[in-house]
């Protein structure tokens, strides 16, 4: 789904419907330490020398639930996510670099300690680079490693 | 194999409500969304909604917010369909149809549908 | 709601023909479309679904193409048993929307 084509799209972006008080997870992860904004998560990331990934959604996206629902069910997804500073956004960041090819849900990107968007980290599809659906969660599982193994390359 | 078998016929007076079962089995129930499309005599095909049995979340066409809801017992591996309110234009055959074995939203196995006829 | 407008509404072929469906969304719906056929008093059956992937036991005669807005199923050549009314359905956006629907007879 890309948010920039489609007018008054933001008005999915409020948390609308929750059954459970909210979390800052959002549904992708409930044990998992999730950050509140952008902001704080390059902050942790930086200060605390792991990666960051960022998934941006949205709530009445049938791609961003189906998403969010193997993420929140894979044991190996959720244990991998311990090692990330995590942040989850219903809404767009100013900053570009976190959408080089457009600002379509659900989509997931890295971001190294020294604050460098992964550009280089991707999924499988060539229209839409950063885009994952719940069939590729091997690819997102070897992505995430990427992210950390790099990492470990950079120190 | 994948099979997903529905409740039998019903007859309803206008204004009452009809519940409809999808018993499941072959596969993972808790981890595909189960989805719920009619289609009236001789019309096409309309989506009502999912939901995901795994945790009950739903989704809902806003032509029938107010008056559907989708329910999923992980005991029996069965999705019920309840519609309130019934006029004669909900007589229709009504589907389950599940999502992609893994998580994904494309409705890939289909009920053999319930007919359900509102007649005063 | 995304609007899908297929057409023809009804096509008359003969066995062997290359049959061509097409289906236009109103906006973007990037790969989400799926194909179905459904024959009188059955269920529908999945045919195609990210607009281009055959479902597991589908004859290789049925494919589908396109992406964003314009999309087509192909049966390459029509066999007698492929008498039905075909549809399409976009699940990019709430709520998921069909396509009208096109019959397909045997001249």
């Known amino acids: 789904r890309d948010t920039t084509v489609k007018p008054g799209a933001k008005k999915d972006t409020k948390d609308s419907r929750p059954k459970l008080p909210q979390t800052l997870s959002r549904g992708w992860g409930d044990q998992l330490i999730w950050t509140q904004t952008y902001e704080e998560a390059l902050y942790k990331s930086k200060t605390s020398n792991k990666p960051l990934m960022i998934i941006h959604h949205l709530d009445e996206c049938p791609h961003s639930q189906a998403l969010k629902k193997v993420f929140a069910e894979n044991k190996e997804i959720q244990k991998l996510a311990e090692q990330f500073v995590l942040l989850n956004l219903v809404y767009e960041t100013t900053d570009k670099h976190l959408s080089p090819d457009g600002q379509y849900v659900p989509r997931i990107l890295f971001v190294d300690p020294s604050l460098t968007v992964r550009a280089d980290i991707t999924g499988r599809y060539s229209n839409r680079l950063y885009a994952y659906e719940p069939a590729d969660t091997a690819l997102l599982l070897d992505n995430m490693k990427k992210a950390l193994k790099l990492l470990k390359t950079e120190l | 194999q994948v099979q997903l078998v529905q409740s039998g016929a019903e007859v309803k007076k206008p204004g009452a409500s009809v519940k409809v079962s999808c018993k499941t089995s072959?596969?993972?129930?808790?981890?595909?969304?189960m989805n719920w499309v009619r289609q009236a005599p001789g019309q096409g095909l309309e989506w009502i909604g999912w939901?995901?049995?795994?945790?009950?979340?739903?989704n809902y066409n806003g032509k029938f917010k107010d008056r559907v809801t989708l329910t999923a017992d992980k005991s029996t591996s069965t999705v019920y369909m309840e519609l309130s309110s019934l006029r004669s234009e909900d007589t229709a055959v009504y589907f389950c149809?599940?999502?992609?074995?893994?998580?994904?939203?494309?409705?890939?196995?289909w009920g053999q549908g319930t007919l359900v006829t509102v007649s005063s | 709601d995304i609007q899908m407008t297929q057409s023809p509404s009804s096509l008359s072929a003969s066995v062997g023909d290359r049959v061509t469906i097409t289906c236009k969304a109103s906006?973007?719906?990037?790969?989400?479309l799926s194909w179905f056929q459904q024959k009188p008093g059955k269920a529908p059956k999945t045919l195609i679904y990210?607009?281009?992937r055959l479902v597991d036991g589908v004859p290789s005669r049925f494919s589908g193409s396109g992406s964003g807005q314009d999309f087509t199923l192909t049966i390459s050549s029509l066999q007698p048993e492929d008498i039905a009314t075909y549809y399409c359905?976009?699940?990019?956006?709430?709520?998921?929307?069909f396509g009208g629907g096109t019959k397909v007879e045997i001249k």
């Open positions: 939901i995901y049995p795994g945790d009950g979340d739903t």
């Open positions: 906006q973007d719906i990037n790969s989400y």
């Open positions: 990210r607009a281009n």
């Open positions: 149809a599940r999502g992609g074995y893994d998580g994904s939203p494309w409705l890939s196995y």
């Open positions: 072959g596969y993972v129930f808790s981890r595909s969304w």
């Open positions: 359905l976009q699940y990019d956006e709430f709520p998921f929307t």
